[in-house]
């Protein structure tokens, strides 16, 4: 089932995506679709990235992350409630049925009255504590034991700190993957 | 040291092509790309294409797409920028450009262009 | 592709002065894979910064860079006589790359 992410129209949504990429060489091509993942590539594709860059993309889709580090993180901007739905992010692995696929839905509200400070509302809300590890090859995935409590003011600070990719990065360099939705 | 040492001048005729070398030096070759930049008398850079020298895969800017062709000798430690059907505007002097082949573990994912060549003046005249 | 627009086009300045160099991205820069580079008349041009804030090697620390997103600014914080010169800002995460079309910061 879909990770949920919420976000408030007008505000920027953010899908997390990340994979570590093999050290040295060539990106892995990732593609970012409007839909969950079908058995190949992406449906209805908003961005798309290569060895190198992203070689594709449709306004307001953008990349804010590291994304040469793995960092592939959509980022929708200015969302309305036609954005709602499901989001396919696509790590095209080389060989055959070697992708690793992530369906993650997003959930637009009304916005509010009363506007929330705005570092928080840029970044989209809910927070389930899970934290996988993967190692270099595709299949090597592992869930670690349960996280320590967190109290709301470390989820916003871990908000605005992933936010701004710093902890993401240091996280991906550990070899971790962070989800947060 | 490191640096890329760029082939020489070069004065051709329109409809003909060009070739132009860039040798690298002191660090592994293969390990970056590189790019092709060029800068057109008392006018901005513009950006042509890269080659993943480890590799050897190419992109292109769409501008010059069908007229550019970049290439590599990894044993020469040399890249090459050929462009073919010249005309009067591709008058310009011709950078090549290092960057890292990524990904890096530490530190941003990339370091843009860090070293460039001297240049080298393609001129197109009748 | 992306376009990059540099203001001011020409930035006269003295020594010891502060420079503010703008950079405005048509749409979102991916990464922030932001650079600038000074090029000299006859020379090629030189990385200052990488990653909309990172000093190259060797660059001395009075450049510095922040933004993101489509805003970048390049800041001298004291002027020296080398300093003068053309400064372009590229973008290097879409493709195909693209350079602003340059600020000429000269003597006043």
């Known amino acids: 089932s879909e990770v949920e992410y919420r976000a408030e129209v007008g505000q920027n949504a953010y899908l997390p995506c990340f994979y570590t990429p093999a050290a040295p060489g060539n990106l892995v091509p990732v593609c970012w679709g409007k839909g969950a993942c079908p058995v190949f590539e992406c449906g209805n594709v908003v961005l798309r990235t290569d060895e190198r860059d992203v070689n594709y993309w449709t306004s307001r889709y953008w990349l804010n992350g590291d994304f040469r580090k793995g960092d592939v993180s959509l980022t929708i901007e200015n969302v309305t409630l036609a954005d709602s739905g499901i989001y396919c992010c696509r790590i095209q692995i080389p060989g055959i049925m070697n992708d690793e696929k992530f369906n993650l839905k997003l959930v637009i509200k009304p916005a509010k009255v009363t506007p929330a400070p705005t570092r928080q509302r840029d970044f989209t809300a809910a927070f389930p504590r899970m934290l996988t590890t993967r190692g270099h090859g595709p299949a090597e995935t592992q869930t670690l034991g349960s996280l320590p409590d967190i109290n709301l003011t470390q989820i916003s600070t871990l908000a605005n700190e992933l936010r701004d990719s710093r902890l993401a990065n240091d996280l991906r360099d550990s070899g971790a993957t962070i989800r947060i939705g | 040291e490191v640096q890329l040492v760029q082939s020489g001048a070069e004065v051709k005729k329109p409809g003909a092509s060009v070739k132009v070398s860039c040798k690298a030096s002191g660090y592994t070759f293969t390990s970056y790309y590189m790019h092709w930049v060029r800068q057109a008398p008392g006018q901005g850079l513009e950006w042509m294409g890269w080659?993943?020298?480890?590799?050897?895969?190419?992109k292109y800017s769409q501008k010059f797409q069908g007229r550019v062709t970049i290439t590599r000798d990894t044993s020469a430690s040399t890249a090459y920028m050929e462009l073919s059907s010249l005309r009067s505007e591709d008058t310009a002097v011709y950078y090549c450009?290092?960057?890292?082949?990524?990904?890096?573990?530490?530190?941003?994912?990339?370091?843009?262009?860090?070293?460039w060549g001297q240049g080298t003046m393609v001129t197109v005249s009748s | 592709g992306i376009v990059l627009t540099q203001s001011p086009g020409t930035l006269s300045l003295s020594p010891g002065e502060r420079a503010t160099l703008s950079c405005r991205a048509s749409?979102?820069?991916?990464?922030?894979?932001l650079a600038w580079y000074q090029q000299k008349p006859g020379q090629a041009p030189r990385l200052l910064i990488c990653?909309?804030?990172s000093r190259a090697t060797g660059i001395p620390d009075r450049f510095s860079g922040s933004g993101s997103g489509t805003d970048f600014t390049l800041t001298i914080s004291r002027l020296e006589p080398e300093d003068f010169a053309v400064y372009y800002c590229?973008?290097?995460?879409?493709?195909?790359?693209?350079f602003g079309g340059g600020t000429k910061v000269e003597i006043k």
């Open positions: 590229q973008q290097y995460g879409s493709s195909p790359y693209t």
């Open positions: 990653g909309a804030s």
């Open positions: 080659i993943n020298a480890g590799n050897g895969n190419t």
């Open positions: 749409q979102s820069v991916s990464g922030d894979y």
């Open positions: 450009a290092r960057d890292h082949v990524l990904p890096l573990y530490y530190g941003s994912g990339s370091y843009a262009f860090d070293i």
